[in-house]
């Protein structure tokens, strides 16, 4: 009897949907695997007789529940199928946005870039999929624990009237208010402000 694949899970970030599993212990030899998805009541092969322990399902529709399954095979024998259900629009993890930061005197000017979606048009981003897409930004003085959060209305934001000659750190994540779902925070970007340009009267 061939044992089934173990630890089957869907690793999905920005709709890059990779079904992953682990090969079970099997004394007779090396196992191969077949992974399928349910399409109009019929299971279709996606990865056949592969020696890999993953299969790319990024071409699935982003909407609705998908049933995926994988089994192990050896010669003419095979294991039972292991099934999982996956809804990309609900289950994918939102990766960190890009961020450009520029210092202008005592202000930080930030521009945000929504994560790109692979296997789509070149310009297609997570913003195109989720109508409620917005950003959470948090910033803090470097070396302190007190943080300030803002929710920009647009793809850019300006932090004004900061302390001069002080290093501020900023990070951003995508946020979906209608789903109360947040994405991964970007790596912090830290920049030092310069002098206050206001002229005394």
């Amino acid at each position: 009897m061939v044992p089934p694949p173990e630890n089957v899970r869907m690793n999905s970030v920005n709709f890059k949907n990779i079904l992953q599993w682990e090969s079970p212990a099997f004394a007779k030899g090396n196992l191969t695997f077949t992974a399928q998805y349910l399409s109009y009541r019929i299971f279709q092969d996606k990865c056949m007789n592969t020696t890999l322990t993953e299969c790319d399902f990024s071409s699935l529709s982003k909407y609705g529940d998908h049933t995926l399954r994988v089994r192990a095979e050896f010669a003419d024998e095979h294991s039972d199928w292991v099934n999982i259900t996956f809804c990309p629009v609900d289950d994918t993890i939102i990766g960190p946005p890009g961020m450009q930061v520029e210092v202008l005197a005592d202000s930080l000017h930030m521009r945000f870039l929504a994560p790109k979606i692979e296997n789509e048009y070149e310009t297609w981003t997570m913003k195109n999929v989720y109508n409620s897409w917005t950003y959470n930004v948090q910033y803090w003085k470097n070396g302190t624990d007190e943080k300030f959060q803002i929710t920009p209305q647009y793809d850019f934001e300006v932090l004004r009237n900061l302390e001069p000659w002080t290093t501020y750190c900023v990070q951003v994540r995508g946020f979906l208010p209608d789903r109360n779902k947040a994405g991964e925070w970007s790596e912090p970007v830290c920049e030092q402000t310069t002098h206050d340009e206001t002229v005394p009267s």
Epitope: R9, N11, V13, Q20, D91, I93, I94, G95, P96, Q138, W140, N142, G143, D145, C169, Q171, R173, K181, A182, G183, E184, W185, E187, P188
Partner: nanobody, 125 residues
């Protein structure tokens, strides 16, 4: 430097429950992933559970699935591991771990950048 403080370990009879807590302090960036791993004497480290703090997405080792639940309170920078139906083979030192990087939901927590000192869980039959 990031500091992690675990609590909630102890001794319990088989079938009992414990709730572990892990609080992150002195951090300089928001945590994307929090998790727990364990190590029993003479055995290899084992990832137990991880959580993506943004959406609350969770992942469990097969050995604890259905018995353990990981959760988080982002406002308190705290992760919890509710352990029910404990078995003698769950006896181990349990460690909390966190990471600020992305894409780590399915990585065992012992691979995370910051780890706590651990809290002992002993389950007797």
């Amino acid at each position: 430097q990031v500091q992690l403080q675990e609590s909630g370990g102890g001794s319990v009879q088989a079938g009992g429950s414990l709730r572990l807590s892990c609080t992150v302090s002195r951090y300089t960036a928001s945590v994307n992933y929090m998790g727990w791993f364990r190590q029993a004497p003479g055995k290899e480290r084992e990832g137990v559970a991880t959580i993506f703090t943004g959406a609350g997405t969770t992942y469990y080792a097969n050995s604890v699935k259905g018995r353990f639940t990981i959760s988080r309170d982002n406002a308190k920078n705290t992760a919890y591991l509710q352990m029910n139906s404990l078995k003698p083979e769950d006896t181990a030192m349990y460690y909390c771990a966190v990471d600020f990087r992305g894409g780590l939901l399915y990585r065992p927590a012992y691979e995370y950048t910051y780890r706590g000192q651990g809290t002992q869980v002993t389950v007797s039959s």
